[in-house]
């Protein structure tokens, strides 16, 4: 009678095993052991029992145990289980952006690992298991179906084997795959808002708004606003679910024409984009020339207005004749049009938009000076001891310097109040001098003395 | 326009000495004329001026000792006994009130009057 | 009599700084007073005339205010070529006046 001991074996691949065989008679003619394994016997006293040492076990065997007795021959086999945990658990790659709603399937794949009966792969979302399968094919392939949801932003998926040696008295081996961190997103099917002055002047700078809603999540969402070529470097806030981006947008003349103003909105995989068009114009204000800013009175004036060739003028509210870019008007200079405005309006389309520009210039009219009876008086009578505030008034622009002398060294204190006394009265030489000249008039004070009764 | 002082130099105390003011570019009829003397080291002193009237009006010290006069072209400052306290740079000037924006605009570089004996 | 007072008689100042003059009239000579500057060995140059206007080719850092009895020169971001002496003038009374002129002020600059 031949036996095996032990009889049954588990043990890790390229692991190695003591096997012992014995046989019943004293005096076997023959005992060993059957197997393609690489041995070594271990030498021990007496003749029944034989040990080997078998290694390098890479898969299932079952080596024999052999005896030859005077009673005849007979076998014991000896069963060697070999585990191994997989070589490769993984998930099968996906983008790592999902829209919200989708149907996402998992497919985790298992290469290797064995005792197949007890390896088993299981599908997680964090700790959550989706589906549990035992490992079957090479590879082994287990897959589930996710409706994506907005709850499931940034949660981490994967996959798990388990290969459960605990009944064989090893423990439960677990490999786990690289995880995929699934990025949730809504991006709603209306494009994005955008707010923009339809015409823009060469040289100014507008203010451009693109706005949507209904985005998660609203902070991953990248926003690109350009005019033509030009980039534009938005400012950008969010709300719960929504973002409003605002940019200057500067125009220069090599700007000039119609431009494609662009926002697009990119959130995942997935885009919105609004389209408008915006009209660069130039348009300068109208040029207002005087023949002369400044002119001596009962000079011929020439007030031109000249704008934008396409434009339209009014010159002091009065449209040009014919209707067009110029208009022009001609005035003798009197001392009432010193001060006076000419305002040019010219109005200009662009792009069914009425765009108006204005610039006025003042005439300057030089006259005087002038003294008159009216504004400065040649007799004044006031009593002694009174007070009394000559008044003297000059004309011209530019305004004169008004002196009021007698005997050409006692000024007379005009628009001051002054207590009347002897030394008051006399005639006083008025003079009122510009860069227009010099004219004077004589003012007499007559001083009444107080009757004494 | 111009004024021009003449006649300083030295004199003796309690002589008589009349210095000229020499103007041109405008008229005597119509501006007054005034003297105005400074000691060495000390500040301006206001003498007396002749109206374009020909009046005369004089610092309150200044009366009977000084007497201004004019012709067309000139004004003259007669000083009567002179003393050593006379010594100063006498100045003509063209009376200020009058002025477009000049006053006292006008002086004269002014003469020396020594009064020593 | 329309006497005329200065003061200081004499101000130390440094370059870049501001001076003030004041000057009063024993009464009323309305706006009618001037400011004069003398530099040794030359003859006065008219600064301010009617209180406040300002002499032509006279720079702006200059000013003249005040009217009646009271009134003031303000020299600001003084330079040295304004060392020299300053004077105040009435302009109002030619007669019964002892001076029309006030005593002076020396301004030296450091």
């Known amino acids: 009678q031949t036996s095996v001991s032990p009889s049954k074996v588990i043990l890790p691949r390229g692991g190695s095993v003591l096997v012992t065989c014995s046989t019943s008679c004293d005096q076997p003619k023959l005992l060993g052991i059957e197997t393609p394994l690489p041995k070594k016997e271990l030498l021990l006293p007496g003749n029944n029992r034989k040990v080997y040492e078998l290694s390098n076990v890479q898969e299932d065997s079952q080596p024999m145990c052999y005896s030859n007795c005077p009673d005849g021959q007979s076998t014991a086999k000896t069963f060697l289980t070999v585990y191994w945990t997989p070589e490769r658990v993984e998930l099968a790659p996906l983008p790592s952006w999902q829209p919200v709603g989708k149907n996402l399937t998992l497919r985790c794949q298992v290469e290797g690992g064995a005792p197949r009966a007890n390896l088993t792969v299981v599908l997680l979302r964090g700790e959550k298991e989706l589906k549990r399968e035992p490992a079957v094919g090479e590879p082994a392939e287990v897959t589930t179906t996710v409706l994506v949801r907005r709850d499931h932003h940034g949660a981490n998926f994967s996959c798990r084997t388990e290969l459960d040696l605990r009944p064989q008295g090893l423990e439960l081996f677990e490999n786990t795959s690289a995880p995929y961190q699934l990025q949730t997103f809504v991006l709603p099917a209306t494009p994005p808002q955008l707010v923009s002055p339809r015409v823009l002047e060469v040289d100014t700078q507008g203010t451009v708004v693109c706005s949507l809603d209904g985005l998660f999540p609203v902070s991953e969402a990248q926003v690109h606003l350009a005019l033509g070529d030009q980039r534009l470097n938005p400012t950008v806030t969010y709300g719960n679910d929504s973002f409003s981006a605002k940019a200057s947008v500067s125009v220069t003349a090599e700007d000039e024409g119609t431009q494609r103003l662009t926002c697009a909105v990119i959130l995942g995989n997935q885009s919105q984009e609004t389209l408008q068009t915006v009209t660069i114009y130039s348009f300068p204000a109208p040029n207002v020339i005087l023949t002369k800013p400044e002119v001596s009175e009962g000079t011929e004036v020439t007030v031109k207005c000249e704008a934008h060739p396409r434009a339209k003028v009014t010159l002091n509210g009065v449209p040009a004749q014919p209707l067009g870019p110029r208009a022009q008007l001609l005035l003798k200079a009197t001392p009432e049009d010193n001060g006076r405005s000419f305002s040019c309006s010219a109005t200009l389309e662009v792009a069914g938009q009425l765009i108006h520009k204005n610039q006025t210039r003042e005439l300057r009219v030089l006259y005087g000076p002038r003294l008159d009876e009216r504004d400065c008086p040649g007799n004044w009578t006031w009593p002694e001891n009174s007070q009394q505030t000559p008044m003297c008034q000059a004309w011209g622009n530019p305004l004169p310097e008004l002196k009021c002398l007698k005997d050409g060294t006692f000024p007379l204190p005009i628009g001051e109040s002054v207590t009347v006394t002897r030394d008051l009265e006399g005639t006083y030489l008025c003079r009122a001098r510009s860069t227009q000249g010099e004219v004077t008039r004589k003012v007499t004070v007559n001083v009444l003395s107080p009757r004494y009764e | 326009q111009s004024v021009e002082e003449s006649g300083g130099g030295l004199v003796k105390p309690g002589g008589t000495l009349t210095l000229t003011c020499t103007v041109s570019?405008?008229?005597?009829?119509?501006?007054?004329m005034g003297w105005v003397r400074q000691a060495p080291g000390k500040g301006l002193e206001y003498i007396g001026i002749?109206?374009?009237?020909?009046s005369t009006y004089y610092a309150t010290w200044a009366k009977g000792r000084f007497t201004i006069s004019k012709t067309s072209t000139t004004v003259d400052l007669k000083i009567t006994s002179p003393t050593t306290e006379d010594t100063a740079t006498y100045f003509c000037?063209?009376?200020?009130?009058?002025?477009?924006?000049?006053?006292?605009?006008?002086w004269g570089p002014g003469t020396l009057v020594t009064v020593s004996s | 009599a329309y006497d005329m007072s200065q003061t200081p008689a004499s101000v130390e100042v440094a370059v870049g700084g501001t001076v003030t003059i004041k000057c009063q009239a024993s009464?009323?000579?309305?706006?009618?007073l001037s400011w004069y500057q003398q530099k040794p060995g030359q003859r006065p140059k008219l600064l301010i005339y009617?209180?406040?206007k300002l002499a032509s080719g006279v720079p702006s850092r200059f000013t003249g205010s005040g009217s009646g009895t009271e009134f003031t020169l303000t020299i600001s971001g003084v330079q040295s070529d304004d060392a020299a002496t300053y004077y105040c003038?009435?302009?109002?009374?030619?007669?019964?006046?002892?001076?029309?002129f006030g005593g002076g002020t020396e301004v030296v600059v450091k």
């Open positions: 000037v063209r009376d200020p009130y009058d002025s477009y924006d000049a006053a006292y605009r006008l």
């Open positions: 570019g405008f008229s005597l009829s119509s501006y007054a």
């Open positions: 002749i109206g374009s009237s020909g």
């Open positions: 009464q009323s000579i309305y706006s009618y």
């Open positions: 009617d209180a406040s």
């Open positions: 003038q009435q302009a109002y009374s030619s007669s019964n006046v002892d001076n029309v």
